[in-house]
Interface confidence: low
């Protein structure tokens, strides 16, 4: 692998659609990790500081953003579904964390070049009672 | 897995104001339905995956489409998949 060509992911959480909430009484948050290379990532959801597995579905493998390119960057998506009540409780805090492994020439966090470094990147959301 | 009460729907999700990515969620569809990849290289569509809400004994299929294109719309995101016309739920304008 070309260790100079490492791109960490951009992570964003997308909040549930009010249409889904009113129609199903459930709320789905989507986490997108995009633009990363190579494809070594681990994605996890954290609710109120604890990792959750129930209600979570993550792509089994990252998607090539440009399938025609051999060294295309990758994306990964994940869904977290909770009850509408749980989403609307403003005390509830949702975080999608992506761990990215890699080395790069200009990343400040690469201190030891012999070992892969774990970079934690996360995006967060709070339950909403209002705007 | 067997989905007890399929209720296919496509919802538009909102990110932060600074995020120019649009995300569409296709969810609650029957397991026999397949999700096709986009022919547009700027539109990304995931394979379907199963989500299990164990506490509610509820399973659902889902797929996500997203793009940075300014004209990207959820009504056309899954146009290469066979989706009923009444599946699309417009995203209400934010009152914030």
């Amino acid at each position: 692998e070309d260790l100079k060509k490492v791109f960490p992911p951009k992570v964003a959480v997308f909040e549930p659609s009010e249409a889904e909430i009113s129609h199903t009484q459930k709320a789905t948050l989507v986490c997108l990790a995009t633009g990363f290379y190579p494809d070594h990532v681990e994605l996890s959801w954290w609710v109120n500081g604890k990792e959750v597995h129930s209600g979570v579905s993550t792509d089994p493998q990252p998607l090539k953003e440009q399938p025609a390119l051999e060294d295309s960057r990758y994306s990964l998506s994940s869904r977290l579904r909770v009850s509408a009540t749980f989403w609307h409780n403003p005390r509830n805090h949702f975080r999608c964390q992506v761990q990215f492994y890699g080395l790069s020439e200009d990343d400040e966090w690469t201190e030891d070049r012999d070992k892969p470094i774990t970079q934690k990147i996360s995006a967060e959301a709070w339950g909403r009672a209002d705007c | 897995p067997y989905i007890q009460n399929p209720d296919p729907a496509v919802y538009q999700l909102r990110g932060s104001k600074s995020n120019d990515t649009s995300v569409c969620l296709f969810t609650d569809f029957d397991s026999v339905m397949n999700v096709s990849q986009s022919k547009d290289s700027d539109v990304h569509i995931t394979d379907k995956t199963v989500l299990d809400m164990r506490s509610m004994d509820f399973k659902s299929n889902g797929a996500v489409a997203w793009s940075n294109k300014s004209d990207f719309a959820c009504t056309s995101a899954f146009k290469d998949s066979v989706i009923p016309a009444d599946t699309f739920f417009p995203s209400p304008e934010s009152s914030c």
């Epitope: 909040e15 403003p90 995006a123 | -």
Partner: nanobody
Framework: EVQLVESGGGVVQPGGSLRLSCVAS????????YGWYRQAPGKEREKVAH???????DYADSAKGRFTISRDESKNTVYLQMNSLRPEDTALYYC???????????WGQGTLVTVSS
């Protein structure tokens, strides 16, 4: 926009105490999460303590039993009371605020805490 200004850092002997303050200004009514983080020389920034709406708190293992996070809503201020300080607590301490909708994430400039005899 939200601005965060930390204060209260300084030099203290092992076993001593300090109280850090973080004053928030701007659109503070949108904030419902505050946190204290620290970064020691040559190390990654790490969580120390969080406080959220309803005053729910959460501490890093290294802070449990020694540090207390609190807030005074009327003063838009978050505090970190640090007792039984150790040399390994030496770091730049940052205040963080998160607004209702991600990823409106704000950080202060930091205040330096040095624990040394």
């Amino acid at each position: 926009e939200v601005q965060l200004v930390e204060s209260g850092g300084g030099v203290v002997q092992p076993g001593g105490s300090l109280r850090l303050s973080c004053v928030a200004s701007g659109y503070v009514h949108k904030i419902n999460f505050y946190g204290w983080y620290r970064q020691a020389p040559g190390k990654e920034r790490e969580k120390v303590a969080h406080i959220s709406i309803g005053d729910q708190t959460d501490y890093a293992d290294s802070a449990k039993g020694r540090f207390t996070i609190s807030r005074d809503e009327s003063k838009n201020t978050v505090y970190l009371q640090m007792n039984s300080l150790r040399p390994e607590d030496t770091a730049l301490y940052y205040c963080r605020a998160l607004s209702r909708i991600w990823p409106y994430d704000y950080w202060g400039q930091g205040t330096l805490v040095t624990v040394s005899s």
